[in-house]
């Protein structure tokens, strides 16, 4: 048993059939000695007298919370929360395994550029009765300052006959040179609570890992004399990191219908235009990444041929 | 204001096209060690990551875009302690911060390029012959080195008596591979840097 | 199977003007760019142009602008090149070859084989 | 118009050996760079496109790197069925040009 956060405990317990389950011993944060009760949630049922609880803690029904009284008034309380391993593992029922971009995968974390901020996610079916706390440093030996903000509500998704909630975080590190090597990895940590389980996840990334940058701004099209061929332009996101003379990004333009069997016209360049074949019905796109280190691509940025 | 992001021509800053080669050697001899050692921990989230150019080297301050001079945490120890020659420098008027930053790339380089050739010779007495260094990418080492000619003392090629550990070598290939690509990574940004300016 | 398949060997006096034909199979005929490409005996590849078999649009590589026309006929998934003035250079196997991509080719014809010759 | 150089023009390998051949642009191209294998009276055939995406039926070691004016196309291990000539194209910009061809000969 540890503490989560004051008059929050967790349990953690091997689950099996006939599993015996952990004793636990609950003291009562008071000065008195004699004449206290024990009642665990809503019910007026005393579960035992005296300072300290004495209670075996085998299945969901054993959690709650335990409150200690004298005379009808309440001295403290202590909630119990059970963390389930199965086989070895630590449960994960709370988080949907997002499967990209490996299996048991829970938190996702991208960053827009180089400042030391980012953002994680992680998905839920479960809408009620459920907190998130985080926390985050670089390093775990000897960590250094990551501040997270709280966890949000940021999407709701109707997948068939669910419901799925996506959660948000954005932390950022307390000192990051965006010119900086890392050796170190960032470390998320999210405990989840739904109802009486408590279930932790983590995640470690370089933030060069998990860059993707916003898509490029202001695309323009300047038709070209005598032929078929259009010029693009377009500049850099503002929240891409400078300057832009070291932080470059590359860029891939793209000419397709709406359809992504369609044919198209593709080209990748390192300035900030290019020039592509129009079609009538069809798009131009671009999108970005960092030059050097290839992290993710920038979602699309388009305007129609026309 | 940010600086002009068209990169004009290569010859115009002889390292930017070097620095260039030297980061997809790295890249393509990083992917084929870890095709080739897949039963190795090769991968970013296996290994330690370890810098052989740690207190003895200091590229990334000493290469600092202007723009991150404001910026404090950029700013934990700026080393001031190379040697200011070189054949990449594109004017006279070439600060002197600019020559510390080239000198401690050439330092890089040259650490880098001793590690890599005493593995290499160990690797090659592996009687399963299993990986090799890219002499590509020892070539292009060594074209930037020139590129960047500095005048400095030639480090002894380690020589090791005893038996080595194949296994250990391999593993130790994947962490210097690692970490050579993230200071590859800055080098091309310092030359694109210096080239736009 | 996408087959492109094109019309036989011919030979032809200088100043005259070939037309080789390039017949697609397997596939959308107006979902693919056609490209026209030539090699001459022992030399390298020489791209001439494309057409979009959807809405005719073409493309010519400048040096065989005003002597190339290439053209497609949808109801045969048929495409067509036209070269006219020719000169004992034009001598040379002349490839069609397709792609969803517009810049590089994924399939190809077997070659068309046109000698200019007096 | 974008010239593409390919060196060597003549490559003789014994069959198990590696095979590089490398092609360079007289510009920057980024990673608009497609290499193709071409054997004596066949179509040209794609191998590798866009520097390093490789084809589905293509055999796993033919390989491509480079960006920017230089290129590379490695073979790790030569078969028999891979003597052929190997050329480079340019998808930068129009008019699309291709390197004169790399013949890999048995040595």
């Known amino acids: 048993i540890w503490e989560l956060k004051k008059d929050v405990y967790v349990v953690e317990l091997d689950w099996y059939p006939d599993a015996p389950g952990e004793m636990v011993v609950l003291t009562c944060d008071t000065p008195e000695e004699d004449g206290i009760t024990w009642t665990l949630d809503q019910s007026s049922e005393v579960l035992g007298s005296g300072k300290t609880l004495t209670i075996q803690v085998k299945e969901f029904g054993d959690a709650g919370q335990y409150t200690c009284h004298k005379g009808g008034e309440v001295l403290s309380h202590s909630l119990l929360l059970l963390h389930k391993k199965e086989d070895g593992i630590w449960s994960t029922d709370i988080l949907k395994d997002q499967k990209e971009p490996k299996n048991k995968t829970f938190l996702r974390c991208e960053a827009k550029n180089y400042s030391g901020r980012f953002t994680c996610w992680w998905l839920t079916t479960i809408s009620t009765d459920l907190t998130f706390s985080v926390k985050s440093s670089r390093g775990s030996s000897d960590p250094q300052g990551v501040t997270c903000g709280a966890a949000t509500l940021s999407a709701e998704r109707v997948r068939g006959d669910n419901k799925e909630y996506e959660y948000s975080v954005e932390c950022q590190e307390d000192s990051a040179c965006p010119a900086a090597e890392e050796s170190l990895p960032i470390e998320v940590m999210v405990d989840a609570v739904h109802k009486l389980k408590y279930e932790n996840y983590t995640s470690s990334f370089f933030i060069r890992d998990i860059i993707k940058p916003d898509p490029p701004k202001n695309l323009q099209l300047k038709p070209l004399k005598n032929s078929r061929q259009v010029e693009v332009s377009w500049e850099y996101p503002d929240t891409w990191s400078t300057p832009h003379s070291y932080f470059s990004l590359t860029f891939c333009v793209q000419v397709q219908g709406k359809s992504k069997r369609e044919k198209k016209d593709r080209v990748f360049t390192d300035k900030t235009s290019a020039t592509v074949i129009c079609r009538k019905n069809a798009s131009i796109s671009v999108r970005a990444q960092d030059r050097y280190y290839s992290s993710s691509w920038s979602e699309w940025a388009s305007v129609p041929c026309s | 204001r940010n600086l002009p992001v068209a990169t004009p021509d290569p010859g115009m800053f002889p390292c930017l096209h070097h620095s260039q080669n030297l980061l997809r050697a790295v890249s393509n001899m990083l992917q084929k060690a870890r095709q080739t050692l897949e039963f190795y921990p090769c991968t970013s989230e296996e290994i330690d990551h370890e810098d052989i150019t740690k207190d003895k080297t200091s590229t990334v301050e000493a290469c600092l875009p202007l723009e991150l001079t404001k910026n404090e945490s950029c700013l934990n120890s700026r080393e001031t302690s190379f040697i200011t020659n070189g054949s990449c420098l594109a004017s006279r008027k070439t600060s002197f911060m600019m020559a510390l930053c080239l000198s401690s790339i050439y330092e890089d380089l040259k650490m880098y390029q001793v590690e890599f050739k005493t593995m290499n010779a160990k690797l090659l007495m592996d009687p399963k012959r299993q990986i090799f260094l890219d002499q590509n990418m020892l070539a292009v080492i060594d074209e930037l080195m020139q590129a960047l000619n500095f005048n400095s003392e030639t480090v002894p090629q380690k020589s090791s008596l005893e038996e080595p550990d194949f296994y250990k070598t391999k593993i130790k290939l994947c962490i210097l591979l690692h970490a050579f690509r993230i200071r590859a990574v800055t080098i091309d940004r310092v030359m694109s840097y210096l080239n736009a300016s | 199977q996408v087959q492109l398949v094109q019309s036989g060997a011919e030979v032809k006096k200088p100043g005259s003007s070939v037309k080789v034909s390039c017949k697609a199979s397997g596939g959308t005929f107006s979902d693919y760019y056609l490209h026209w490409v030539r090699q001459a005996p022992g030399q390298g590849l020489e791209w001439m142009g494309w057409i979009d078999p959807e809405n005719g649009d073409t493309e010519y590589a400048p040096k065989f602008q005003g002597r190339v026309t290439i053209t497609a006929d949808e109801s045969t998934s048929t495409a067509y090149m036209e070269l006219s003035s020719l000169r004992s250079e034009d001598t040379a196997v002349y490839y069609c070859?397709?792609?969803?991509?517009?810049?590089?080719?994924?399939?190809w014809g077997q070659g068309t084989l046109v000698t200019v010759s007096s | 118009d974008i010239v593409m150089t390919q060196s060597p023009l003549s490559l003789p390998v014994t069959p198990g050996e590696p095979a590089s051949i490398s092609c360079r642009a007289s510009?920057?191209?980024?990673?608009?760079l497609h290499w193709y294998q071409q054997k004596p009276g066949q179509a040209p055939r794609l191998l590798i496109y866009f520097a390093s995406q490789s084809i589905s039926g293509v055999p796993s070691r033919f390989s491509g790197s480079g960006s920017g004016t230089d290129f590379t196309l490695t073979i790790s291990s030569l078969q028999p069925e891979d003597f052929a000539t190997y050329a480079c194209q340019q998808s930068n910009s129009f008019p699309l040009t291709f390197g004169q061809g790399t013949k890999v000969e048995i040595k």
């Open positions: 510009q920057s191209i980024s990673i608009n």
């Open positions: 070859a397709r792609n969803k991509e517009l810049r590089y080719f994924d399939v």
